[in-house]
């Protein structure tokens, strides 16, 4: 069973609406965990949710709280709560097979579509996450390059499926 | 009676919702009409609606059209239609007291709050606009000096001649 999966609610519809309701060229800052694009999720997920929480909290400050309907504020507020729950859950499960990257996350700018693809992928990682004893796979080999591993893209920071 | 006032609908509530639903630090490009900062609004309002139309059309392209409720796309689409009506109306009334600057408008960046304040007040200017033959207010002439008017001195004047 996935760690913290009970904390994850189905927010796909809200995220789709939010992405549509943000300017396509608006850039969201996220401290991106190195290796997220090539390593298994247990290597980066604990750190990624912390960074997502920070980014979403910052993003929330950029909007006004209007009571009417599903506003960007209300959607982001909901997402912040989901991620904050996951951050707590990660702390509770820190002894389990959740690794901390030895490289510091680097601030990068992402479009809303890119940012919420990372968000969705991180959420999905919790749904599917299963404790495993294998730990050696959290090292990015120095020999791993775009020529040797087709999963790494030089032009894009990650290769993720489109937002559902 | 205001020129084109019948083309103006009450969109204040929609604009308020839109501003709240845009990131506070998102910058919207508007070609700023030279003299707008120092000349009365009847000197530049006709040109401003053309620029607002362009900016809003560009802004519309930054959003996805989602059918659900009052999305940013649907609000901006409505505002584009209002402004495009005013642009047509300006053309119809171009022989009236609406001035055109010979200087090209310069692109400037505005926050959503600033941009839509300009939008709202441009709309209001049409509601209140009254035809008048007086055009001298639209020219800051180099002949205006302490000799002609002891209260003011002008250096590096704008030259915005009225258009017949």
């Amino acid at each position: 069973e996935g760690i913290c999966r009970n904390r994850v609610t189905n927010n796909v519809k809200d995220v789709t609406k939010l992405v549509a309701n943000l300017p396509k060229d608006y850039m969201i800052t996220l401290k991106y965990v190195p290796g997220m694009d090539v390593l298994p999720s247990h290597c980066w997920i604990s750190e990624m949710v912390v960074q997502l929480s920070d980014s979403l909290t910052d993003l929330l400050d950029k909007f006004s709280n209007i009571s009417e309907g599903l506003s960007n504020y209300s959607i982001i507020d909901k997402l912040v709560n989901i991620v904050d729950d996951l951050v707590e859950c990660v702390k509770e499960n820190s002894s389990k097979d959740l690794k901390k990257s030895f490289k510091s996350p680097e601030p990068r700018l992402f479009t809303p579509e890119e940012f919420f693809r990372i968000f969705n992928r991180s959420i999905d990682a919790f749904k599917d996450f299963v404790v495993a004893s294998e730990t050696s796979d959290c090292v990015v080999s120095s020999t791993l390059s775009p020529e040797k591993d087709s999963r790494v893209s030089v032009t894009k920071p990650f290769m993720l499926p489109p937002v559902a | 009676e205001g020129i084109c006032r019948n083309r103006v609908t009450n969109n204040v509530k929609d604009v308020t919702k839109l501003v709240a639903n845009l990131p506070k630090d998102y910058m919207i490009t508007l070609k700023y009409v030279p003299g707008m900062d120092v000349l009365p609004s009847h000197c530049w309002i006709s040109e401003m609606v053309v620029q607002l139309s362009d900016s809003l059309t560009d802004l519309l392209d930054k959003f996805s059209n989602i059918s659900e409720g009052l999305s940013n796309y649907s609000i901006i689409d409505k505002l584009v239609n209002i402004v495009d009506d005013l642009v047509e109306c300006v053309k119809e009334n171009s022989s009236k007291d609406l001035k055109k600057s010979f200087k090209s408008p310069e692109p400037r960046l505005f926050t959503p709050e600033e941009f839509f304040r300009i939008f709202n007040r441009s709309i209001d200017a049409f509601k209140d606009f009254v035809v008048a033959s007086e055009t001298s207010d639209c020219v800051v002439s180099s002949t205006l000096s302490p000799e002609k008017d002891s209260r003011v001195s002008v250096t590096k004047p704008f030259m915005l001649p009225p258009v017949a």
Partner: antibody, heavy 115, light 105 residues
Framework: LVESGGGLVQPGGSLRLSCAAS????????MSWVRQAPGKGLEWVSA????????YYADSVKGRFTISRDNSKNTLYLQMNSLRAEDTAVYYC???????????WGQGTLVTVSS | QMTQSPSSLSASVGDRVTITCRAS??????LGWYQQKPGKAPKLLIY???SLQSGVPSRFSGSGSGTDFTLTISSLQPEDFATYYC?????????FGQGTKVEIK
Amino acid sequence: LVESGGGLVQPGGSLRLSCAASGFTFSSYAMSWVRQAPGKGLEWVSAISGSGGSTYYADSVKGRFTISRDNSKNTLYLQMNSLRAEDTAVYYCARRDFFAHFDVWGQGTLVTVSS
Amino acid sequence: QMTQSPSSLSASVGDRVTITCRASQGIRGYLGWYQQKPGKAPKLLIYSASSLQSGVPSRFSGSGSGTDFTLTISSLQPEDFATYYCAEYIRMPYTFGQGTKVEIK
């Protein structure tokens, strides 16, 4: 808008006022200095266009005062030379909105010209 | 030149107060009304002769065009005791009226 630089100066002396702006696109707005002598009304002193390319002065200060701005620092200035007793006033910087005249004002800075 | 009247007036809370301003030449609707309290900066109340500035209570209203303008406070409140100025902004030099002081009766 926050003014600074006021103080006591002797007749014939100089003073430079500054006005730090925040919270709006400074370079897009014309800015003005307006003064108010003790117990008197408001008097417009000078204005400058958003780009800084055009400047305007009341005749009472022409040739003595210079208005300028540094858009990179979001700051408006008023250089006051050859000061006179009648220049004693609270000096306010104010933003001229495109439609609404002076819609944002600073708190003012007192300039006292006295020997 | 802007001529404001009266120069001062005494009124009670709840009173309807009217201040007038006359321009020496036509200024269309390019007139603003400001409120100033002792030791404070002026505050814009009305612009374009009749448009209420954002955040200003609706008891304040303005009217007029051309040369004659009016500021009305429909029901005077304790915080409204202050000095009021009109100002034109169609052309520089911008000129202010001499002010109307609204005092407690």
